[in-house]
Interface confidence: medium
């Protein structure tokens, strides 16, 4: 059926230029791969505020993820990942933005920190939601477990962890098979 | 060519109530968070309210909250300020704005403003 | 909150002049810091958003710098229409303003 698929990536300090980017084309090469499917894509930076880069409507406009990501600024400040998935949830998956009635709602988050708000993401629960924590701070299994809380269950299936932002090149094949 | 317009604003009684409105145009209005931003005579600006985008969220200035209510409708791109309960120190002139990006805070295209006079 | 403090409050120029206005934030906010113009009985309008990135349609003779705490808005030849009152304001958490700053014909 239709998969109506958002990225919801980390946009903050943390990241360094060369990370951002490697973001950047992981999300790209999943868009690539999945050119002629019955998924739709859209992007949302976050930090301390969040900005849709690209909806679907754009996608389905510009099918071109070198494009459609093309003037994308890093934002460098904060990790507002509560309030950035809940922007998604109200604000992205919405049907006069190009979103699908009848499509299975999915959410890839990608960061590189802890969540620097707090807050519920109960508008979320429709959604299935991944997310990959890459990097230095997601080195302990404490921090590793704040980010269960932005998943869906279980764990196992829904959060990633990768040691570095390398990895995120190999991801796409795992992840392929659990959507 | 952007535009907000805002109406709705004038002389109103200490208690009274004021609905401003701000028309938009030349824009996706219903992809943008707005922004209702005071001026008193003579003075700084201050902001008053938000709303995002679907209408889902609002936000008020502690000054405001619990008088003033925020809306908006996406089918007429057109955004609201209900005001009730209205004191002397909310006599101001009104604008109506609308934001770079999702929750920049920063504002972008300002209307012309309407003016409210609190007074007995 | 975050208090955002101008300076100076007014200041006196002639058309060719190069005029400079600094804004001091009581906190660090990255580069969320944006820059409006007003004149007499008309609405703000966006001269500058984060820090440096010119509104679309606003002279080049305008510019932003800094981060962090201290901005700067430079004029670098004031021309008649820019005789005005400026306002920096974050937008790094809920926005605040400075309190103004007027332009005048010296």
């Known amino acids: 059926g239709n998969v109506d698929l958002v990225f919801l990536f980390d946009g903050s300090m943390s990241l360094q230029p060369d990370e951002f980017q490697k973001i950047l084309d992981f999300m790209k090469d999943v868009m690539k791969k999945l050119s002629n499917t019955s998924y739709q894509f859209a992007a949302v930076q976050f930090s301390t505020s969040y900005k849709t880069e690209f909806d679907f409507s754009d996608y389905v406009k510009r099918k071109d993820p070198d494009a459609l990501l093309k003037h994308v600024k890093h934002m460098l400040l904060l990790t507002n990942t509560f309030g950035a998935i809940n922007y998604v949830a109200t604000e992205v998956f919405r049907e006069e933005l190009g979103a699908r009635p009848d499509a299975t709602k999915v959410l890839i988050i990608i960061t590189d920190g802890e969540a620097t708000d707090s807050g519920n993401i109960d508008a979320a629960k429709d959604i299935i939601r991944y997310i990959i924590g890459i990097g230095k701070h997601f080195q302990t299994k404490e921090s590793q477990e704040t980010l269960h809380k932005f998943a869906s269950k279980p764990a196992s299936e829904f959060v990633c962890i990768l040691d570095t932002f390398e990895c995120l090149k190999d991801l796409f094949t795992e992840l392929q098979k659990k959507i | 060519e952007v535009q907000l317009l805002e109406s709705g604003g004038g002389l109103v009684q200490p208690g009274g109530s004021l609905r401003l409105s701000c028309a938009a145009s030349g824009f996706t209005f219903s992809r943008y968070v707005m922004w209702w931003v005071r001026q008193a005579p003579g003075k700084g600006l201050e902001w008053v309210s938000y709303i995002w985008p679907s209408g889902g969220n609002t936000y008020y200035a502690d000054s405001v909250k619990g008088r003033f209510t925020i809306s908006r409708d996406n089918s007429k791109n057109t955004l609201y300020l209900q005001m009730n309960s209205l004191r002397a120190e909310d006599t101001a002139v009104y604008y109506c704005?609308?934001?770079?990006?999702?929750?920049?805070?920063?504002?972008?295209?300002w209307g012309q403003g309407t003016m409210v006079t609190v007074s007995s | 909150d975050i208090q955002m403090t101008q300076s100076p409050s007014s200041l006196s120029a002639s058309v060719g002049d190069r005029v400079t206005i600094t804004c001091r934030a009581s906190q660090s906010i990255g580069s969320y810091l944006n820059w409006y113009q007003q004149k007499t009985g008309k609405a703000p309008k966006a001269l500058i958003y984060?820090?440096?990135s010119l509104q679309s349609g606003v002279p080049s003779r305008f510019s932003g710098s800094g981060s962090g705490t201290d901005f700067t808005l430079t004029i670098s030849s004031l021309q008649l229409e820019d005789f005005a009152t400026y306002y920096c304001q974050q937008s790094y958490s809920t926005p605040s303003f400075g309190q103004g700053t007027k332009v005048e014909i010296k």
């Open positions: 704005a609308n934001s770079y990006d999702f929750r920049s805070n920063a504002f972008a295209v």
């Open positions: 984060a820090a440096s």
